[in-house]
């Protein structure tokens, strides 16, 4: 099938002991090969500081996955989710303030 770019969605969890969990979800993409990783100041975090979900079919002939990491509250602006898929790439910031959702579709 033809390439379908992912929809990327960044969310923050509730604060716990001064930390928040930020999750980056990629959905509705094809083919299934994708790079999804958190970056701090532009540099990728190590694998052992991130959690990945499996790349799973979403029932529409496309796929979905996620990556999460814990960061200190107040340092959200230093972190971005980096996505690479079928030669396209994008960088997605952690939402600031009270806006806890950020969606972007890659074309």
């Amino acid at each position: 099938g033809s390439t379908v770019p992912p929809m990327v969605n960044v969310t923050c969890s509730e604060v716990s002991e001064g930390n928040i969990t930020v999750t980056c979800r990629a959905s509705s993409f094809y083919p299934r090969n994708i790079t999804l990783t958190w970056r701090q100041d532009g540099v990728s975090l190590s694998h052992n500081t991130q959690q990945w979900g499996d790349v799973l079919p979403d029932g529409n002939g496309t796929y979905q996955t996620w990556v999460a990491t814990r960061i200190r509250q107040g340092e959200e602006q230093r972190f971005t989710c980096y996505m690479e898929h079928s030669g396209n790439h994008g960088t997605h910031p952690v939402p600031s303030g009270n806006s806890h959702h950020h969606h972007h579709h890659h074309h």
Epitope: T37, V43, S44, S46, R78, T80, T91, H92
Partner: antibody, heavy 122, light 112 residues
Framework: QGQMQQSGAELVKPGASVKLSCKTS????????ISWLKQKPGQSLEWIAW????????SYNQKFTAKAQLTVDTSSSTAYMQFSSLTTEDSAIYYC???????????????WGQGTLVTVSA | DVLMTQTPLSLPVSLGDQASLSCRSS???????????LEWYLQKPGQSPKLLIY???NRFSGVPDRFSGSGSGTDFTLKISRVEAEDLGVYYC?????????FGGGTKVEIK
């Protein structure tokens, strides 16, 4: 590699503001992190802040949060730093520099502008 | 903030000599991702700094192999195996592992 061309020298009065520019060419502007740095005559360098051109996201050295404001204009591939409430302590050369990242590898200030001399004097 | 201390302040050399520059950080500068982002820059009079070494020991593109970096933890060294005239200037070490990113005070390499 690309180029980073900074605006010309500025002579400003105490209390005023100045907006410095860093026009880039030869690379994909929106993919890059750009930092601004300060160097007083005969002294070492200080990192002020970075801006990610793709989103406009910034991170500041706390020492400069009330002093500097970074912005970008993607249509002209130009980064800006506005420096406010200037004092004689702000007299320095200000550099823009581009980061060069590859995953967990990479260099912080791989490519530099030529610098802009800012003189604060009554 | 991480304090970066460079020694010596001035290093007089003869052309062709080996030069050794030291940089010490006030705390361990291993990044959260396990890498050590210690860099060396050379600034010649009236010029912008130029990157020589990144991640402790990696030469940046176009940097001659007479420059080598080493070290770990808090102690780092830049060696110039045979000093040439174009190597004269002020050398700065820099850490990019902990915000705010910080530079050392510099070592001036000059002719003896």
């Amino acid at each position: 590699q690309g180029q980073m061309q900074q605006s010309g020298a500025e002579l400003v009065k105490p209390g005023a503001s100045v907006k410095l520019s860093c026009k880039t060419s030869g690379f994909t502007f929106s993919d890059n992190y750009i930092s601004w740095l300060k160097q007083k005559p005969g002294q070492s360098l200080e990192w002020i802040a970075w801006i990610y051109a793709g989103t406009g996201g910034t991170s500041y050295n706390q020492k400069f949060t009330a002093k500097a404001q970074l912005t970008v204009d993607t249509s002209s591939s130009t980064a800006y730093m506005q420096f406010s409430s200037l004092t004689t302590e702000d007299s320095a050369i200000y550099y823009c520099a581009r980061h060069d990242y590859y995953g967990t590898s990479g260099a912080w200030f791989a490519y530099w502008g030529q610098g802009t001399l800012v003189t604060v004097s009554a | 903030d991480v304090l970066m201390t460079q020694t010596p302040l001035s290093l007089p050399v003869s052309l062709g000599d080996q030069a050794s520059l030291s940089c010490r950080s006030s705390q361990n500068i291993v990044h959260i991702n396990g890498n050590t982002y210690l860099e060396w820059y050379l600034q010649k009079p009236g010029q912008s700094p130029k990157l020589l070494i990144y991640k402790v020991s990696n030469r940046f593109s176009g940097v001659p192999d007479r420059f080598s970096g080493s070290g770990s933890g808090t102690d780092f060294t830049l060696k110039i195996s045979r000093v040439e005239a174009e190597d004269l200037g002020v050398y700065y070490c820099f850490q990019g592992s902990h915000v705010p990113w910080t530079f050392g005070g510099g070592t001036k390499v000059e002719i003896k």
